[in-house]
Interface confidence: low
Amino acid sequence: VTGSRVYPANEVTLLDSRSVQGELGWIASPLEGGWEEVSIMDEKNTPIRTYQVCNVMEPSQNNWLRTDWITREGAQRVYIEIKFTLRDCNSLPGVMGTCKETFNLYYYESDNDKERFIRENQFVKIDTIAADESFTQVDIGDRIMKLNTEIRDVGPLSKKGFYLAFQDVGACIALVSVRVFYKKCPLTVRNLAQFPDTITGADTSSLVEVRGSCVNNSEEKDVPKMYCGADGEWLVPIGNCLCNAGHEERSGECQACKIGYYKALSTDATCAKCPPHSYSVWEGATSCTCDRGFFRADNDAASMPCTRPPSAPLNLISNVNETSVNLEWSSPQNTGGRQDISYNVVCKKCGAGDPSKCRPCGSGVHYTPQQNGLKTTKVSITDLLAHTNYTFEIWAVNGVSKYNPNPDQSVSVTVTTNQAAPSSIALVQAKEVTRYSVALAWLEPDRPNGVILEYEVKYYEKDQNERSYRIVRTAARNTDIKGLNPLTSYVFHVRARTAAGYGDFSEPLEVTTNTVPSRIIGDGANST
């Protein structure tokens, strides 16, 4: 059974004689008269298992002590740390020539963990061990132990395990502890990459290249690599990992952003507090949710505040000029926190009797500089119909308006265009023709452009070619022209008048009066 003792993280202990409970039971040769297992107590009443030999009076000593089989656990080079006391021969009377102040350290590789005997010729010498002046004093109750520590290494090893042996050639020694260990570069996290426990190489100068794996919630930026040096120290970190979105580096880990914070990308940045008008309700947020009524445009960075649509434009002023309207307005009181505000114009043509019955103005209306996406706060609208009710809406929009089309974003004005001369009359008909008269009727102009005050009928004999014509005026859309000559061709033109003036005459209508005293009823443009 092995008790727990604390050693450096880069050392893996294969054997520690101080941690063994009970007797060590190593093999000695000769069985008696050489190395002997002796227990002493330290100042904490803890038994120390030692092996001692002190045959300094007798010549030609060759006392061997062999450990149990030690597994190498994949290590290619192992280290042997020996703590021992060694008597100064000068302090022992009458031992000149037979007393030695060194012992020899050997090893033997073997796959057999049950070898019962020491075969000296199988062992390979590691070194001769001598006491030096660098000792530590260990209190063992009523005595002070001058404890030397020597470390040797051996390798490369290839078999499953090995035995160590100590050869005494006539010294006075107490082996207080024997510890066998190998070195590893311990599991570590560097640059957010985890590097596993790595056993050092076979040579004291070798470097083992190790690829790291990114810690949880991180990803490779550059391939993380390090080199495990022979002394169990990690060297030359290359590459790194970055915490994923929603995570930041804290204590060598990628930890989730706390509530109210976020991180949008895999970078080495820390989590940032949610921008204004946004929040996160879970840990590990990659973006923050906008507050109710606030939005983030598609091309807005996650770091930008959430914004909202603008309020309505202010102070809309209209200026009507015949069939054109100039509109001007002021910027909204609240731009929603955005710079990308623009304006759209909606034009509706509304009935005079019922303003609620409005229809889009259609493509015949023109806008200067443009109808949508206006960056200025004025627009000129032309090619409107005269004497018509129009409602114009100015909509303030920004990059988030599409997410919340809100009626209070617009301001409207209703105007009536000025009256204009009417358009020409499209259809004039001769309804009844007699020898001396023609009854005419016609349609209202397509575009009255105002209130029709009267119609003017101009007629003349065809042969006269308008050199001598007569005028008849009427408020109705029909009239009887009397006092005509029989069997004569007449040409009729009709035009309408509004407060703004006369429109163009209609196309000519040619009618020939009858020769017989009867009526001809006609509805064509030309009656003969």
């Epitope: 706390k258 509530i259 109210g260 929040y279």
Partner: antibody, heavy 124, light 107 residues
Framework: QIQLVQSGSELKKPGASVKVSCKAS????????MHWVRQAPGQGLKWMGW????????TYADDFKGRFVFSLDTSVSTAYLQISSLKAEDTAVYYC?????????????????WGQGTTVTVSS | EIVMTQSPATLSVSPGERATLSCRAS??????LAWYQQKPGQSPRLLIY???NLADGIPARFSGSGSGTEYTLTISSLQSEDFAVYYC?????????FGQGTKVEIK
């Protein structure tokens, strides 16, 4: 130093309302949520619920839904507990206690600072 | 809801003696447990959090142990100021319920 100071004792008639205040000092008010705990005479402690000091959103334990309202005035770092339609069984000491709103290291929760308690007595 | 059961209801101990208080949860609360001390007329005081962690300023004679559903508060050598009522409370899913308390009184 960090402390939660509650308003003084109240004696009310059944059917009345009472509003208990809990003023925080010595720390950032919005970094800690505020919880309310009731202790009826000679009885143990009962968690009533809490209010998020950043958002003002309250959470009520099932037994305290309806007549109990948690509110805040962050400008004066104060949390309030209002009880309406008081009943004799509402007679108790009411404590406020704080818990970190955000967790930086340990994810374990605990009430590290308590108010001194407010006694509400309901009697006709 | 999770029911917290403390035992014993009353513990009579002489000063200098060891006191062991138990708290059982009706289901695994994964060490999400705090212990509080309350003296008459005072508000509760945090002693232990996360089942085993000693709160700031609390003497080392107080210790907490346990996991799963069974938890213990130990006072290694009772002092006169330790006689009070002790409550356990879980934080594993709301509502956060308290135990009914253990009164530690002078024997």
């Amino acid at each position: 130093q960090i402390q939660l100071v509650q308003s003084g004792s109240e004696l009310k008639k059944p059917g009345a309302s009472v509003k208990v205040s809990c003023k925080a000092s010595g720390y950032t008010f919005t970094d800690y949520s505020m919880h309310w705990v009731r202790q009826a005479p000679g009885q143990g402690l009962k968690w009533m619920g809490w209010i998020n000091t950043e958002t003002g959103e309250p959470t009520y334990a099932d037994d305290f839904k309806g007549r109990f309202v948690f509110s805040l005035d962050t400008s004066v770092s104060t949390a309030y507990l209002q009880i309406s339609s008081l009943k004799a069984e509402d007679t108790a000491v009411y404590y406020c206690a704080r818990i970190p709103l955000y967790y930086y290291g340990s994810r374990y929760w605990y009430f590290d600072v308590w108010g001194q308690g407010t006694t509400v007595t309901v009697s006709s | 809801e999770i029911v917290m059961t403390q035992s014993p209801a009353t513990l009579s101990v002489s000063p200098g003696e060891r006191a062991t208080l138990s708290c059982r949860a009706s289901e695994n609360i994964y060490r999400n447990l705090a212990w509080y001390q309350q003296k008459p007329g005072q508000s509760p005081r945090l002693l232990i959090y996360a089942a085993t962690n000693l709160a700031d300023g609390i003497p080392a004679r107080f210790s907490g142990s346990g996991s799963g559903t069974e938890y213990t508060l130990t006072i290694s050598s009772l002092q006169s100021e330790d006689f009070a009522v002790y409550y356990c409370q879980h934080f594993w899913g709301t509502p956060w319920t308290f135990g009914q308390g253990t009164k530690v009184e002078i024997k």
